[in-house]
């Protein structure tokens, strides 16, 4: 049994309010900001996490070349609109009626427009490239040890099925983790690569979303793996639509 039942907390999401008011007095947890019920045995969707983060008090918060269509999240934090399943709505707008289209990880994929902007569907991010630079160590990590440890991390901590970790590349001090998950591959109950990547990003920044206060302890053969820089590239099933003005800016 879990602490979520004993102490009524959510192991996988500290941005929740929990109480024993579920069926049969079971612990039920709701995400801050949205009030939506969350499943504490798995990751909470990035949309609900961003919404919770925006509702919280401000003081609480062989290498691959990314394709020309790869997106980087330059816009940063915003208060998103989530659908009833907790996914990002395809169209996001701010309080001043400026709107834009996002992909399944909530990253803007069009120019900003007004309320007349149409976003016909939520485009899936099917390939995520996580680019890390680790702090200096006595020597390079053994590539196969590093590969095995990162695959185990994503499987056990983030509950991501191993088939979605496509590759781990290493050229000291750069580590790249490739996550791939097409719409057709994702079964009911599978963790989304976008959610896993977001939890990993927050872990690496020392802002763990898990209940435990100690944060991530990642070691390769006993040697701590400490990251000093992270870049995440997102590739969508349909390329983004930006005007040439943005591309030349």
């Amino acid at each position: 049994h879990t602490a979520a039942q004993d102490n009524c907390t959510c192991p996988t999401n500290k941005m929740t309010v929990c109480s024993p008011d579920g069926p049969g007095g079971r612990c039920q947890c709701r995400a801050l900001g949205s009030g939506m019920a969350v499943d504490c045995s798995t990751l909470t969707s990035k949309c609900l996490l961003l919404k919770a983060r925006m509702s919280a008090p401000k003081n609480a918060r062989t290498l691959v070349r990314p394709s020309e269509h790869a997106l980087v999240d330059n816009d940063g934090l915003y208060d998103p609109d989530c659908d009833p399943e907790g996914r990002f709505k395809a169209r996001q707008c701010n309080q001043t009626s400026v709107c834009w289209c996002v992909n399944s990880v909530g990253v803007r994929r069009t120019d900003k427009g007004d309320l007349s902007l149409r976003c016909d569907e939520l485009v899936r991010t099917h390939h995520i490239l996580i680019d890390l630079r680790h702090r200096p160590t006595a020597g390079a990590f053994n590539h196969s040890d590093l590969d095995a440890e990162l695959r185990r991390l994503f499987r056990e901590r983030y509950r991501l099925h191993p088939k979605f970790v496509a590759a781990v590349h290493y050229e000291q001090p750069t580590i790249q983790i490739e996550l791939r998950q097409n719409t057709s591959q994702k079964a009911a109950g599978d963790v989304d690569i976008g959610d896993a990547a977001y939890y990993f990003e927050r872990d690496i920044k020392g802002e763990s979303l898990f209940q435990g206060r100690g944060g991530l302890d990642l070691r390769v053969r006993g040697e701590p793996l400490q990251v000093e820089r992270t870049l995440i590239y997102y590739l969508d099933e349909i390329p983004p639509k930006f005007s040439m003005k943005r591309l030349t800016a």
Partner: nanobody, 121 residues
Framework: QVQLQESGGGSVQAGGSLRLSCEAS??????MGWFRQAPGKEREAIAN??????NYADSVKGRFTVSQDNARNTVYLQMNSLKPGDTAMYFC??????????????????WGQGTQVTVSS
């Protein structure tokens, strides 16, 4: 879902020894801790183990040893030089995988049902 089952508790004379076992099904790469709770007292962290690194509460240092057999998915607590003050219900617990190991019970996610240890003088 990780499930933990303790065994090895019982009654022993002061100065004696016991070895507790905690078998984990659905085992994950987690910090594993041993806790105890005497009647009317707070739950107390006594030892933990993670990746071969161990940590002990001052009250049991030098007397208790925590170890791990990954092939059997089992964590052990060898208790020597037992005292009447060690009488309590003993629990094993696991943190969420890859969480930094600690002694705070609130950081542990999975718990066993406990095994009783009674030390008489």
């Amino acid at each position: 879902q990780v499930q933990l089952q303790e065994s090895g508790g019982g009654s022993v004379q002061a100065g004696g020894s016991l070895r507790l076992s905690c078998e984990a099904s659905g085992y994950t790469y987690s910090c594993m801790g041993w806790f105890r709770q005497a009647p009317g007292k707070e739950r107390e962290a006594i030892a933990n183990i993670y990746g071969g690194r161990t940590n002990y509460a001052d009250s049991v240092k030098g007397r208790f040893t925590v170890s791990q057999d990954n092939a059997r998915n089992t964590v052990y607590l060898q208790m020597n030089s037992l005292k009447p003050g060690d009488t309590a219900m003993y629990f094993c617990a696991a943190m969420w995988p890859y969480d930094r190991c600690g002694m705070d019970a609130r950081d542990y996610v999975y718990w066993g049902q406990g095994t009783q240890v009674t030390v008489s003088s």
